[in-house]
């Protein structure tokens, strides 16, 4: 199946041109400079001549020129200017601003808490299964299996730190070698990027917002997948990560350090521990083949326990069974002996909602999964709304310029590296790459941060999470110190290698181009976003897992033809876009393939039929519900209460978004609303800080 459909007769657009290597980041689009594309991924693109009847763009612009959907929207400020306000108005505006800030911080707090609870929910639903993945003996010999186990486990427990700590404990216990652990760590790196992709799905309501948010989130996915694609074979062939980290570990005489500082957890833990508390040791115990752990619940019941090594009296059949006569006696009826036991006395129960319910882990997990997703979604909507009302006019201009503008020449290239450092620093502070990248996603969506700027921030986030792991490793007990430090360093150097591959040269920033391509597809066919998530994070890893279990022969037998077809398609695609004359006329486009193999349109029809039953009875009860509905069915016939279905005509027009080559993007006319230029509901209540 050709991955770049509907490119048959695409004619290059002479008006568009490639930007220089400096990669100047865009600010708010200027109408006078509309053709100056700021995306360093730009290439020729098809013009869309027809404009929708409702678009006001026809009254202002030339009909042949359309806005680049990747340009940041102008967040219009329709409020009264600060200078024009009277004292009462200024005071009112000031308190409104304070109120908004408090609300923003409040929703941000619950957003982060819901991410934590989402992780707990995933662990309750799939934690034990995740633990059992690790107990597979084939991991030692099959790096591909190790990789997919890393992905699946991290997706199932929604925490790369949990999966890496399991790996560390397995290496410390000699159940796993460092060599076998490296692919698992690579997989964990991929798995952790699902969180912000899920967060991006929550912004499905507005097409242009969703386009940016989803691309901004998946840039992380593509970076990780591409890094693994290149670095896993390199590691298997050279073992460079293993060798470098071993040299580092052996050259230093590390003493046990202190724990990595819990900065964000200090604030969120008081709340999240009232919802649920988990005994994460259970997953590790299952991974290490502890049979007893399989029947244990992950929900923590006792928080205060007293562990005492003591000798207890136990009965024995006869005095012959005694260890020594001095430790043996009778009570006249039974024979007794002394046995050394570690006695755990439960003192105080945990203070969380589920402590007295005694529900199975799956039930608790399902409840928490639904609730955390609802809270996550609700908080995200509110954050976007508040940011939307705050970031208008001059405020937006200042913020956008600060975040997205490069250093002056000749230091422009340094900006990205500073962003990497900022990303690493922020992740170190919040102690979680998932939290940082998830917080970044809505900002990309509403157009505060460009994807070009989000990319280095995300890369920095990947580094930040490994520095946390290194600190945690230094705090490990003696026996686990070496292995945990070596694994943490492998993680660190893997990410550094990935950055060296996909960042320094603008041409190599493939993840941005791929993410934008996926953003375009997902904006048009919103179901494709869910499809992508299932395929990349579940189906592909599970398929590889299944084939690996069947043995090397089966894996190679199926894998080689698949890889061959993918390479063939990519080569053909490259020739089609670069030098089509080399190819026979038939192969110069994809028209020789049936429509379902080169376009998502037929698939969209299938999905629409499948979800048709939901379309008529969509939920108009609330925005949250409506967004979920829109994600499923694009819902053009109802839900007038939400933005998600206001682009009825756009959906009915059926302008197919081509799944294009990485270096091309679509030009779609966006309504004023989609551009973010929504008029304020009441100018009296709107105010700007500047």
């Amino acid at each position: 199946m050709a991955p770049w459909p509907e490119l048959g007769d695409a004619q290059p657009n002479p008006d568009k041109y490639l930007e220089g290597a400096a990669g100047q980041q865009p600010t708010a689009p200027d109408k006078s400079k509309e053709t100056n594309k700021t995306d360093n991924t730009e290439a020729p693109v098809t013009k869309i001549e027809l404009l929708p009847s409702y678009s006001t763009a026809t009254l202002i612009d030339e009909p042949t020129e359309v806005d680049d959907p990747w340009n940041l929207p102008t967040l219009q400020d329709s409020g009264i200017k600060w200078s024009e306000r009277d004292t009462k108005g200024k005071i009112l505006c000031f308190f409104q601003g304070i109120g908004r800030l408090i609300l923003l911080l409040g929703f941000l707090y619950f957003f982060v808490c819901s991410l934590d609870i989402l992780s707990s929910a995933f662990q309750l639903v799939g934690g034990k299964m995740a633990g059992q993945f690790f107990s597979n003996s084939s991991i030692m010999s099959n790096p591909l299996l190790g990789l997919v186990i890393g992905v699946l486990v991290t997706v199932l427990v929604q925490s790369s730190s949990t999966s890496t700590s399991i790996v560390v404990s397995m290496v410390s216990s000699s159940l796993l070698t460092v060599r076998a652990a490296i692919p698992i760590i690579m997989g964990a790196n991929i798995g952790t990027s699902i969180t912000n992709t899920i967060v991006a799905l929550m912004q499905v309501g507005d097409r242009s917002e969703f386009r940016r948010a989803f691309a901004g989130a998946t840039v992380h996915d593509f970076f990780n997948w591409l890094s693994v694609l290149v670095l896993l074979p390199v590691e298997v062939a050279t073992h460079y990560l293993e060798i470098i980290t071993q040299l580092i570990v052996e050259s230093f005489h590390f003493k046990n350090g202190e724990d990595a500082p819990d900065l964000l957890k200090v604030i969120t833990k008081p709340f999240t521990k009232l919802i649920v508390q988990l005994d994460k040791k259970v997953i590790s115990q299952i991974a290490m083949n502890d049979e007893k752990a399989k029947n244990k619940s992950l929900v923590k019941i006792w928080c205060k326990t007293f562990t005492n090594k003591t000798q207890i009296n136990v009965t024995v059949p006869s005095t012959a069974n005694c260890t020594s006569p001095s430790l043996c006696w009778t009570d006249g009826i039974q024979n007794w002996t002394m046995k050394n036991v570690t006695y755990k006395e439960n003192i105080a129960k945990c203070q969380h909602i589920f402590v007295n319910f005694h529900l199975p882990d799956l039930a608790v997990g399902t409840i928490l999964l639904i609730l955390s997703l609802l809270v996550l979604c609700g908080c995200l909507i509110m954050i976007v709304k508040i940011l939307g009302s705050v970031l208008k006019g001059q405020v937006a201009t200042v913020i956008k310029k600060t975040i997205n503008t490069d250093f002056p020449f000749p230091f422009a290239w340094l900006t990205g590296y500073l962003a990497i450092l900022v990303g690493a620093g922020m992740t170190f502070i919040v102690q979680s790459s998932s939290v940082f990248t998830s917080a970044l996603t809505p900002l990309i969506g509403i157009g505060v941060i460009t994807i070009e700027r989000a990319y280095p921030l995300t890369l920095g986030s990947n580094i930040g999470t490994t520095t946390t792991a290194i600190l945690a490793a230094l705090a490990s007990p003696g026996n686990a110190l070496r292995s945990s430090l070596q694994i943490a360093l492998c993680h660190f150097f893997f990410n550094i290698s990935g950055i060296l591959l996909w960042y320094p040269i603008p041409f190599t920033r493939l993840p941005i181009r791929m993410a934008k391509g996926l953003g375009n597809i997902s904006a048009k066919y919103r179901w494709f976003a869910v499809f992508y998530l299932i395929i990349f994070f579940f189906l592909i890893p599970l398929t590889v897992f299944g084939l690996s279990l069947a043995g090397w022969r089966v894996l190679v037998g199926v894998g080689v033809p698949v890889v061959f077809i993918i390479i063939l398609v990519l080569c053909l695609r490259l020739l089609q876009s670069r030098c089509p004359r080399v190819l026979p006329k038939k192969l110069q486009n994809w028209n020789f393939l049936p429509l379902w193999m080169r376009s998502l349109k037929p698939w969209d029809a299938v999905v629409s039929k499948f979800t048709g039953c939901f379309q008529m009875r969509c939920c108009c009860c609330c925005r949250v519900c409506c967004r979920a509905c829109c994600l499923l069915c694009d819902c053009p016939k109802c839900c007038r209460c939400s933005k998600c279905c206001e682009d009825l005509e756009e959906a009915q027009e059926g302008q197919d978004v081509p799944v294009k080559a990485p270096e091309t993007f679509d030009n779609i006319t966006i309504s004023r609303e989609a551009q973010g230029e929504v008029p304020a509901s009441d100018s009296k209540t709107e105010c700007t800080a500047l």
């Epitope: 006569p325 043996c328 006696w329 009778t330 009826i333």
Partner: antibody
Amino acid sequence: QIQLVQSGAELVRPGASVKMSCKTSGYTFTTYNVHWVKQTPRQGLEWIGAISPGNGLTSYTQKFKAKATLTVDKSSSTAYMQLSSLTSEDSAVYFCARGGFRLGSMDYWGQGTSVTVSS
Amino acid sequence: DIVMTQSHKFMSTSVGDRVSVTCKASQNVGTSVAWYQQRPGQSPKELIYWASNRFTGVPDRFTGSGSGTDFTLTITNVQSEDLADYFCQQYSSPPLTFGAGTKLELK
């Protein structure tokens, strides 16, 4: 306080049987074993056997296996010992005693029941 | 069966003296030994368990010692009420067995 009160002295004919009681109080009857000990001037103290009131398990010394039968009545926290086929050899003072917790030592003793076998 | 031997049937002492009553087991019994005191016309009372642990309410002039096969009950500063029979008992393995007893009397 912990007390073990035994039934009064018995005068029985040879070949007959006797059943003596040991009423306990001041502790959880089912938690501690009840031991029976025979004392004669010639033999000194001899352990007859013990019973666990909680589960009814019994243990006898070989010499008394055919002679003694130990039972309990949990409702009245009373232990009983029946001696059968009595001979003059069985004339003695019989003590009931509470066993130490999971121990074979005896921490509290009854006042004793004197059994005289005579024709 | 384990035989507990108390070598002295009688031991003479004076008030205020120190006396040691001995007991020997026919095999290793560890520390599974108890000591009892029986005053004339009364039932036995437990003094020591686990060879050296004093039972509740027992005066500290009574001390138990020993392990394996040799055990000793020591009474320091003998009082007139201490004049009684003293029995050792093993509970290392069934059946429980007692020593023949040692009678403590005034010189």
